[in-house]
Interface confidence: low
C-alpha cells in the first residue's frame, strides 16, 4: 500500500523550532572549526592588546564589500573550496618605479605592475591560489566607457583578458576583475615584475580611443596628505589562498572515502 | 537528552531502493506534465504518420547539442523558468537580400540580419522570451582569432555586445552568443529588419584587423548541392519562450500562496 | 564531487547520485514524447551521516563536515547539486513542438 | 523565491528561510573571532508537502510541483539555495589573519 511507503520516506512532522535552532548553532560551531581545520578554538594568550591594525581592517573590509564585476552568487564549490581561504592583498608597484617609464605616454591605456616576490610571499605555491581579483578604484566618470584588460605577455606583447562597460557615475566605485589564471601563471614562472594594461576599447572604425576613466593611483599633482590616501587606494590584487599548512592536510585526505 | 532530538529530525534509516526509484519515476511523470502545464498526456489522434519532419529534428538537435560559449551549468532557476520553454529558430535573412549591399565591403566584419516579423511570429510578446542565442557555424580556423559581436543600433552605429577568443580548429564548431536582451528589444520596437555584426577585435595599436574566421553562410562560389546544406546551416537565432497560452496561466498564479 | 563519475563506479552507501534511466514508453506508459525515447534522470540517495552529539569526539566530527554536513544544517539531506535540461519533441494536435524542460537530469548530489 | 524578503515578512509554514543571528560570544562562547562579532546565518525549515499517492487528484498535484517538488524527488527536502561567504578576522599566536569562509549565510531555500 502506497501510504506506508510515504511514511518510510518522510521526516517526522512535529518539528520543534528551538531544537532546530540549537542544532543549527551547534552545527555552525563545528562548521567554522572544520573550515579552518582547527580541532579546537585557537589560544588567545599571545594576542596583542588594543584594536585590530588598520591594514587588517582594510583587508577585512575589502573582502566584505561586494564590488562591480564580481559575481553575486558563488558557483557550487569544489571540494577544496570548502575550507577557509586566507585573504591577503598585494598593492601595485608605485607609479614612480622605472618599470613604468617606457609605458607612460599612451592616451588609451594605463599600466599596473606587480612585484612577484610579494605575490610568492603571500601564496608560496600556484596550486594554493583559489581566487585572485584585480581591484581598481574608479573615480567619477562623465561618459560611458568601454574598457579592456590585458596581461603583459612577452617583451612588448599583450594578451586580452576581459572587458567591462562602465556606466557614468558621480561617485567613486571599486571595480573587480577575476585574474586567477593569470596570477597562477605568474606564480609558476620566474619573472620579477608582471603587469596588466587597462585600455579603451578600440573599434576598427572609430577614431577617438582615449581612456576617459580616471583610476585612483594614476592622477598626479595632488596635495601631500591626499596623495597618501590615494596611494593606499591604488590598484591591488586581492588574493584568496589555502594556507600552506592547511594544504598539507588536504593532500593526505584527497582520496575521499 | 540529545539522542531523542536526533530521532525527531532524521529520516527513517531503512530505505528501499526500488521504492525510491518507483517514487522518483512517478514524481517525474508529474514533473513533466506540470512543466508543460498539461493535466494529462496530450491526445495522439491527429499526429501525422511517418518520421518527424527534418526541420523539427534539426531544431531538436540544436537544442540538445552543447555549443561553445554556452554555459554548461544552468543558474538556479527563477520561478517562471520552472515551466517548459518552446524552442523555435529563425534563420538569418539570406545574403543575396538587398539589406546586405551597403555592408558587403569590410574585411574586418560580417553582417547578419533578421526579419523581425518572423521573430514576432515565434514570440508574440517580449516578456515571453526567456533566452535567445545567436548560433554561428564556424568552419576551420588556422590561427587564434579574437572576435566581437555588435548590435545594429541607429542608422550606422553599432553597440558592442560581447566577445570571444576562438582557438584554432580543424573541424567546424557551433558558436553561441546570448542575445536575449537584444532580441527582447527588437520585439518591443517597430523595426522590420534588425542585425548583428561580427568583427575582428581591433586593438588600438595593431595593424592587421582582418576577420580570419570563416562563418558558414557567407562563403561564395560553392557547388549548388553544397550551397543548400550551407544555407541550412547559416546563422540563426535559437529562441526559448513561454507559449502564449501557458503565459496566461502564469499571470493568474503570480501571487504565489 | 558526488557526481556520476564517482558514484556510478563506486559502492558508496552515503549520499550519492544513483543511476536511473527512464524509458518513456516502458516506465511511464507514454507514447506521446517522440524524442528522446527516454533519458538518464538519475536521483540522489543516501544518508548524510553526520550527527552532532555531546559524546562524539570533536576532531572526528570536524573531519566529517566537508562530506556530510558542509552547510551546517540541523538535519542534512542528500539533494541534487548539478542539474541539466532535457529537450523533448511532442505533438499538440498535428503540430510538432520542441520544448526544453529545465533541471531534469541529475548530474551530482550533495549533503545540504 | 523563498528568500529573506518573502520568508521574513510572512508566516509561511512550508519550506522557507528562517531568521537566525549567531553572536559568537553569546551563542558559541567564543572570544577568538575578532571580526565580525556575529552574523546572520539563517537556516531552512518547513515541509515540502507534496506527497504522491494514487488517490491524489492529478491536476491538484501538478499545480503543487513548482513549489513543493520542482526537482521531482522521491522525498523532497527543504535546503539552502543561495548562500554567501563570511570573512572573519582571528589571531594565530600574535599574527592576525583574515580568512573567508564559503557558503556560511543562507539567503534563500528551495524544496529539492
Amino acid at each position: 500500500d502506497y501510504k506506508d511507503d510515504d511514511d518510510k520516506l518522510s521526516t517526522s512532522k512535529t518539528i520543534d523550532m528551538e531544537l532546530v535552532k540549537r542544532k543549527r548553532i551547534e552545527a555552525i560551531r563545528g562548521q567554522i572549526l572544520s573550515k579552518l581545520r582547527l580541532a579546537s578554538p585557537p589560544s588567545q594568550g599571545e594576542v596583542p592588546p588594543g584594536p585590530l591594525p588598520e591594514a587588517v581592517l582594510a583587508l577585512y573590509n575589502s573582502t566584505r564589500d561586494r564590488v562591480a564585476g564580481e559575481s553575486a552568487e558563488p558557483e557550487p564549490e569544489p571540494e577544496a573550496d570548502y575550507y577557509a581561504k586566507e585573504v591577503t592583498r598585494v598593492l601595485m608597484v608605485e607609479t614612480h618605479n622605472e618599470i613604468y617609464d617606457k609605458f607612460k605616454q599612451s592616451t588609451h591605456s594605463i599600466y599596473m605592475f606587480f612585484n612577484t616576490s610579494e605575490l610568492r610571499e603571500a601564496v608560496p605555491e600556484p596550486v594554493l591560489l583559489s581566487r585572485a581579483e584585480l581591484r581598481l578604484l574608479r573615480l567619477k566618470l562623465k561618459v560611458e566607457q568601454h574598457v579592456e584588460l590585458y596581461q603583459k605577455y612577452s617583451n612588448n606583447s599583450w594578451r586580452y583578458l576581459s572587458n567591462r562597460l562602465l556606466a557614468p557615475s558621480d561617485s567613486p566605485e571599486w571595480l573587480s576583475f577575476d585574474v586567477t589564471g593569470v596570477v597562477r601563471q605568474w606564480l609558476s614562472r620566474g619573472g620579477e615584475i608582471e603587469g596588466f594594461r587597462l585600455s579603451a576599447h578600440c573599434s576598427c572604425d572609430s577614431k577617438d580611443n582615449t581612456l576617459q576613466v580616471d583610476i585612483n593611483g594614476f592622477t598626479t599633482g595632488r596635495r601631500g596628505d591626499l596623495a597618501t590616501i590615494h596611494g593606499m587606494n591604488r590598484p591591488f590584487l586581492l588574493l584568496m589562498a589555502t594556507p600552506l599548512e592547511r594544504a598539507q592536510h588536504l593532500q593526505s585526505s584527497r582520496h575521499r572515502r | 537528552d540529545y539522542k531523542d532530538d536526533d530521532d525527531k529530525l532524521s529520516t527513517s534509516k531503512t530505505i528501499d531502493m526500488e521504492l525510491v526509484k518507483r517514487k522518483r519515476i512517478e514524481a517525474i511523470r508529474g514533473q513533466i506534465l506540470s512543466k508543460l502545464r498539461l493535466a494529462s498526456p496530450p491526445s495522439q489522434g491527429e499526429v501525422p504518420p511517418g518520421p518527424l519532419p527534418e526541420a523539427v529534428l534539426a531544431l531538436y538537435n540544436s537544442t540538445r547539442d552543447r555549443v561553445a560559449g554556452e554555459s554548461a551549468e544552468p543558474e538556479p532557476e527563477p520561478e517562471a523558468d520552472y515551466y517548459a520553454k518552446e524552442v523555435t529558430r529563425v534563420l538569418m535573412v539570406e545574403t543575396h537580400n538587398e539589406i546586405y549591399d551597403k555592408f558587403k565591403q569590410s574585411t574586418h566584419s560580417i553582417y547578419m540580419f533578421f526579419n523581425t516579423s518572423e521573430l514576432r511570429e515565434a514570440v508574440p510578446e517580449p516578456v515571453l522570451l526567456s533566452r535567445a542565442e545567436l548560433r554561428l557555424l564556424r568552419l576551420k580556423l588556422k590561427v587564434e582569432q579574437h572576435v566581437e559581436l555588435y548590435q545594429k543600433y541607429s542608422n550606422n552605429s553599432w553597440r558592442y555586445l560581447s566577445n570571444r577568443l576562438l582557438a584554432p580548429s580543424d573541424s567546424p564548431e557551433w558558436l553561441s552568443f546570448d542575445v536575449t536582451g537584444v532580441v527582447r528589444q527588437w520585439l518591443s520596437r517597430g523595426g522590420e529588419i534588425e542585425g548583428f555584426r561580427l568583427s575582428a577585435h581591433c586593438s588600438c595599436d595593431s595593424k592587421d584587423n582582418t576577420l580570419q574566421v570563416d562563418i558558414n553562410g557567407f562563403t561564395t562560389g560553392r557547388r549548388g548541392d553544397l550551397a543548400t546544406i550551407h544555407g541550412m546551416n547559416r546563422p540563426f537565432l535559437l529562441l526559448m519562450a513561454t507559449p502564449l497560452e501557458r503565459a496566461q496561466h502564469l499571470q493568474s498564479s503570480r501571487h504565489r500562496r | 564531487a558526488l557526481d556520476t563519475n564517482y558514484c556510478f563506479s563506486s559502492t558508496e552507501k552515503n549520499c550519492c547520485v544513483r543511476q536511473l534511466y527512464i524509458d518513456f514508453r516502458k516506465d511511464l506508459g507514454w507514447k506521446w514524447i517522440h524524442e528522446p525515447k527516454g533519458y538518464h534522470a538519475n536521483f540522489c540517495l543516501g544518508p548524510c551521516p553526520y550527527i552532532w552529539s555531546l559524546d562524539t569526539q570533536y576532531s572526528k566530527v570536524l573531519a566529517l563536515y566537508n562530506q556530510h554536513n558542509p552547510g551546517a544544517s540541523a538535519a542534512p539531506c542528500c539533494v541534487p547539486q548539478a542539474l541539466e535540461p532535457l529537450p523533448i519533441v511532442y505533438y499538440v494536435g498535428r503540430k510538432p513542438k520542441v520544448e526544453q524542460l529545465s533541471n531534469m537530469i541529475v548530474r551530482s548530489c550533495k549533503c545540504s | 523565491a523563498l528568500d529573506t524578503n518573502y520568508c521574513f515578512s510572512s508566516t509561511e509554514k512550508n519550506c522557507c528561510v528562517r531568521q537566525l543571528y549567531i553572536d559568537f560570544r553569546k551563542d558559541l562562547g567564543w572570544k577568538w573571532i575578532h571580526e565580525p562579532k556575529g552574523y546572520h546565518a539563517n537556516f531552512c525549515l518547513g515541509p515540502c508537502p507534496y506527497i504522491w499517492s494514487l488517490d491524489t487528484q492529478y491536476s491538484k498535484v501538478l499545480a503543487l510541483y513548482n513549489q513543493h517538488n520542482p526537482g521531482a524527488s522521491a522525498a523532497p527536502c527543504c535546503v539552502p539555495q543561495a548562500l554567501e561567504p563570511l570573512p572573519i578576522v582571528y589571531y594565530v599566536g600574535r599574527k592576525p589573519k583574515v580568512e573567508q569562509l564559503s557558503n556560511m549565510i543562507v539567503r534563500s531555500c528551495k524544496c529539492s
Partner: antibody
Framework: QVQLVESGGGVVQPGRSLRLSCAAS????????MNWIRQPPGKGLEWIGY???????YRADWARGRFTISRDNSKNTLYLQMNSLRAEDTAVYYC????????????????WGQGTLVTVSS | DIQMTQSPSSLSASVGDRVTITCQAS??????LAWYQQKPGQPPKLLIY???TLESGVPSRFSGSGSGTDFTLTISSLQPEDFATYYC??????????FGQGTKVEIK
C-alpha cells in the same frame, strides 16, 4: 522496420582500395549515428568507427590511417573508404545504427546489416 | 585503450542450465556495457545495454549485472535457440568502442 544493407564487398588485391556502402531505411537516418564493425572469418568483432549526425567521425586507433567513414544524408547512405588493403583486412564488414542515449555520447549497436564480405588476396 | 576480457572463451551446457558469462574491463567503465548474441551466418543482436537494461523484445531469462570493471551475463534457463556466441562491448564515452573476444555456448 529498420533495414541496413551493405554492398561493395568482393575480392580485391593487396594495396588496392575499396569503398563499401550501407543503404539505410525505416528510420530517420540523418539524426542517427552510424557505425562500421568488421569480423574476420572465425574471429570476433572489431569496431572500426562511427560517424555522428554532425559528420564528426571517431575511429579505432588501428583504422585511422587507412579507413575513412562518411555519409550522405540526402541518399540515406553510409560509406567506408578502405585504402592500402592488406590480407588481414579480410572480413565481413557490418554497418550498424548507433543508439544515442540522451545526455551522453554512449553508443550501443541497435540494429545491424547482414554484412558484406571483403577478401584481400593476390 | 581499455581492454575487454571475456571468460570462458567457450562452454558446453544443456537445455535448462543456468549459464553465466563474465566480462572484465581493464579500467572502470561504470555501467556502459552492452551484450550481444550472434548465431552463425547472422549479424549480432543487441540483448542488454547499460550493463543491466534488457533490450525490448529480449526474453527475460537473459539478465545483466555489474558495474565498474566486472560484468556478468546470465541466462537463467538455457533454451535451444540460445546456443550462439555472446560478445560484451564497452561504450564508455563514445570515442572508443571495444568488444570482448566472445564466448561460444555449445550443446553438451
Amino acid at each position: 522496420q529498420v533495414q541496413l544493407v551493405e554492398s561493395g564487398g568482393g575480392v580485391v588485391q593487396p594495396g588496392r582500395s575499396l569503398r563499401l556502402s550501407c543503404a539505410a531505411s525505416g528510420f530517420h537516418f540523418s539524426s542517427e549515428a552510424m557505425n562500421w564493425i568488421r569480423q574476420p572469418p572465425g574471429k570476433g568483432l572489431e569496431w572500426i568507427g562511427y560517424i555522428y549526425v554532425s559528420g564528426t567521425t571517431y575511429r579505432a586507433d588501428w583504422a585511422r590511417g587507412r579507413f575513412t567513414i562518411s555519409r550522405d544524408n540526402s541518399k540515406n547512405t553510409l560509406y567506408l573508404q578502405m585504402n592500402s588493403l592488406r590480407a588481414e583486412d579480410t572480413a565481413v564488414y557490418y554497418c550498424a545504427r548507433g543508439w544515442h542515449i540522451f545526455g551522453h555520447h554512449y553508443w550501443v549497436m541497435h540494429a545491424w546489416g547482414q554484412g558484406t564480405l571483403v577478401t584481400v588476396s593476390s | 585503450d581499455i581492454q575487454m576480457t571475456q571468460s570462458p572463451s567457450s562452454l558446453s551446457a544443456s537445455v535448462g542450465d543456468r549459464v553465466t558469462i563474465t566480462c572484465q574491463a581493464s579500467e572502470s567503465i561504470s555501467t556502459y556495457l552492452a551484450w550481444y548474441q550472434q548465431k552463425p551466418g547472422q549479424p549480432p543482436k543487441l540483448l542488454i545495454y547499460a550493463a543491466s537494461t534488457l533490450e525490448s523484445g529480449v526474453p527475460s531469462r537473459f539478465s545483466g549485472s555489474g558495474s565498474g570493471t566486472d560484468f556478468t551475463l546470465t541466462i537463467s534457463s538455457l533454451q535451444p535457440e540460445d546456443f550462439a556466441t555472446y560478445y560484451c562491448q564497452s561504450y564508455s564515452d563514445g570515442d572508443s568502442v571495444i568488444f570482448g573476444q566472445g564466448t561460444k555456448v555449445e550443446i553438451k
